[in-house]
Interface confidence: low
């Protein structure tokens, strides 16, 4: 008899048993893939390639291997079916054939099966080796990735540590800044308080200075009057002495003309015998209105009425038309006498104008005009000058013919612009003209390249701001 059965051994391999009479043939076959054609991605006996660099590649190739294994399994199943079919046929033939031939046929079939099985086993071993190789390489890659990850983690930890340190430092510095701000605020508060105290002190001192100035003015005036009274007394005494010593003194009548008590200008004061430079009271022509002026009794024979003086920048000269009309400042320091008074004074008699200038290098110069007068307010106090001599330039730095007077609130210049606003101060601006003695006062080392400074163009050029200026007038026939 003969039969064929299939079973699975303890190792999980398939067993093929052929029972033929007293003889039993057992074949143990591994589950292998079918033979691959040469077009297959991997030849069964090909040398294993280098492991792919990409993880995804490795996965892909593993899937290919799995597919190959699956194909092998399917092929074996087909082979199993084929063997079953053939065995049935051959068993019939064997039964029909002579008993002697059975053994040979069975051996032949067994040999064929063994050869095929051996081949399949070799292929499977190759595949297993490839899979193992791939797995090993993947494990190596994973290990490398793990090492890289560890390094990155360490770097992140280091950076986190640095960030923490920086945050600590930052917190420390912030605290310091806050402390400093606190101290700074305290200091500022203290300084503000000191400033307030100083301002109060300055206010008090200003009041005291004002009082002292008033007292000084009064004292000067009193001194002037005393000088005059002394002069008058001396004249009276001399007159009396002359009368007493005269033989016909009894018949002589002492006639003394009325003493002058008001003065039109400093020249009259000088001629009255008061020859000390200082502040004197002048009276407007044909009026009882008075004005205080500084009289220079020393320069060039004396008798000069000072109409403008700059020396230290203590007085703001960017004033209104009204202020320039009436005068401002202090005759003891910087001041403007007043356009109205000068206009009235120079409109009655012929006056000369002397302008004295000082630069920051210790040089002095002057310009002298032999005829000077100001027109009335209806003509914007237009200036008229002739006959220039002196050391402060051969060309007049006050534009010729004369210009109208302009202030920040009364623009009468020949410029499209507003010269007074642009160049600062009230002046006889042209467009805008070569001079401005009422410009912005600039201290030493800040006095060059200033277009709005105290300028006398034909002596020091346009950008030079002078240290001191004085404008003074005196009758031409003094």
């Amino acid at each position: 008899y003969s039969n064929f059965r299939k079973s699975v051994d303890s190792t999980g391999r398939r067993q093929y048993q052929v029972q033929n009479g007293p003889c039993s043939y057992t074949f143990l076959l591994p589950e292998t893939d079918s033979c691959r054609s040469s077009s297959s991605p991997y030849m069964s006996n090909a040398v294993q390639r280098d492991a792919p660099l990409d993880y995804d590649d490795s996965v892909q190739r593993l899937q290919v291997l799995e597919n190959i294994l699956e194909n092998n399994t399917q092929w074996l199943m087909k082979l199993e079916n084929y063997i079953q079919d053939n065995m049935k046929k051959e068993m019939v033939e064997i039964q029909q054939n002579v008993v002697q031939n059975q053994t040979a046929v069975m051996i032949e079939i067994g040999t064929s099966l063994l050869n095929q099985t051996a081949a399949q086993t070799r292929k499977l071993t190759d595949v297993e080796a490839q899979v193992l190789n791939q797995t090993t390489r993947l494990e190596l890659q994973l290990l490398q990735h793990s090492i890289s990850t560890n390094k990155l983690e360490k770097q992140i930890l280091d950076q986190t540590s640095e960030i923490n340190k920086l945050q600590n430092k930052n917190s420390f510095l912030e605290q310091k800044v806050l402390d400093m701000e606190g101290k700074h605020s305290e200091q500022l508060q203290s300084m503000k308080e000191q400033k307030d105290e100083l301002q109060v002190l300055v206010s008090k001192q200003s009041s005291v200075i004002d009082e002292l100035e008033k007292k000084l003015v009064t004292a000067t005036v009193n001194n002037s009057l005393l000088q005059k009274q002394q002069h008058d007394l001396m004249e009276t005494v001399n007159s009396l002495l002359t009368m007493m010593s005269s033989p016909n003194s009894k018949s002589s009548v002492a006639i003394r003309k009325e003493e002058q008590t008001t003065f039109r200008d400093c020249a009259e004061i000088f001629k009255s015998g008061l020859t000390t430079s200082g502040i004197y009271t002048l009276t407007f022509p044909n009026s009882t209105e008075e004005i205080k002026a500084y009289c220079d009794m020393d320069v060039g024979g004396g008798g000069w009425t000072v109409i403008q003086h700059r020396e230290d920048g203590s007085v703001d000269f960017q004033r209104t038309w009204k202020e320039y009309k009436e005068g401002f400042g202090s005759p003891l320091g910087e001041y403007w006498l007043g356009n109205e008074f000068v206009s009235q004074l120079t409109g009655q008699h012929r006056y000369v104008l002397k302008i004295q200038l000082k630069d920051w290098e210790g040089n002095e110069a002057h310009s002298l005009y032999d005829h000077f007068y100001l027109a009335g307010e209806e003509s914007n106090y237009r200036i008229h000058l002739t006959g220039l001599t002196g050391t402060a330039g051969k060309i007049s730095s006050i534009s010729q013919p004369g210009s109208d007077f302009s202030t920040k609130d009364s623009d009468n210049d020949k410029c499209i612009c507003k010269c007074s606003q642009m160049l600062s101060g009230g002046w006889w601006f042209d467009a805008c003209g070569p001079s401005n003695l009422n410009g912005q006062y600039y201290p030493q080392k800040q006095n060059t390249n200033k277009f709005n400074g105290i300028k006398w163009y034909y002596w020091k050029g346009s950008g030079y701001s002078l240290k001191a200026t004085t404008m003074m007038i005196r009758p031409a026939d003094f």
Epitope: I395, D430, A431, G433, P434, G463
Partner: nanobody, 126 residues
Framework: DVQLVESGGGLVQPGGSLRLSCAAS????????IGWFRQAPGKEREGVSC????????YYADSVKGRFTISRDNSKNTVYLQMNSLRPEDTAVYYC???????????????????WGQGTLVTVSS
Amino acid sequence: DVQLVESGGGLVQPGGSLRLSCAASGFALDYYAIGWFRQAPGKEREGVSCISSSDGITYYADSVKGRFTISRDNSKNTVYLQMNSLRPEDTAVYYCATDSGGYIDYDCMGLGYDYWGQGTLVTVSS
């Protein structure tokens, strides 16, 4: 370094035109007056035209009125002198000068001008 550079001069026939340029470097022209002056051979230097600083008021010598035009372009730091209807008597070396006072006076005297260019020759001849 403060510098003024004139350009645009050359030979031109009577009745022709030229445009002179005065380019400033080292300072901004905004607050400066600029004057054009000329000096013919054997003659004194004379003021031709000036332009004040921010307001742009201009002056012209009687001999060039109606023919010459002065203008300024503060963004280019340059002043121009457009000369039309040129005559042989306009032949001279033309200079530009700047006055940091920003003013111009009636005759563009130029005695106190702070900086001067090297000049450009204008020849009017047939």
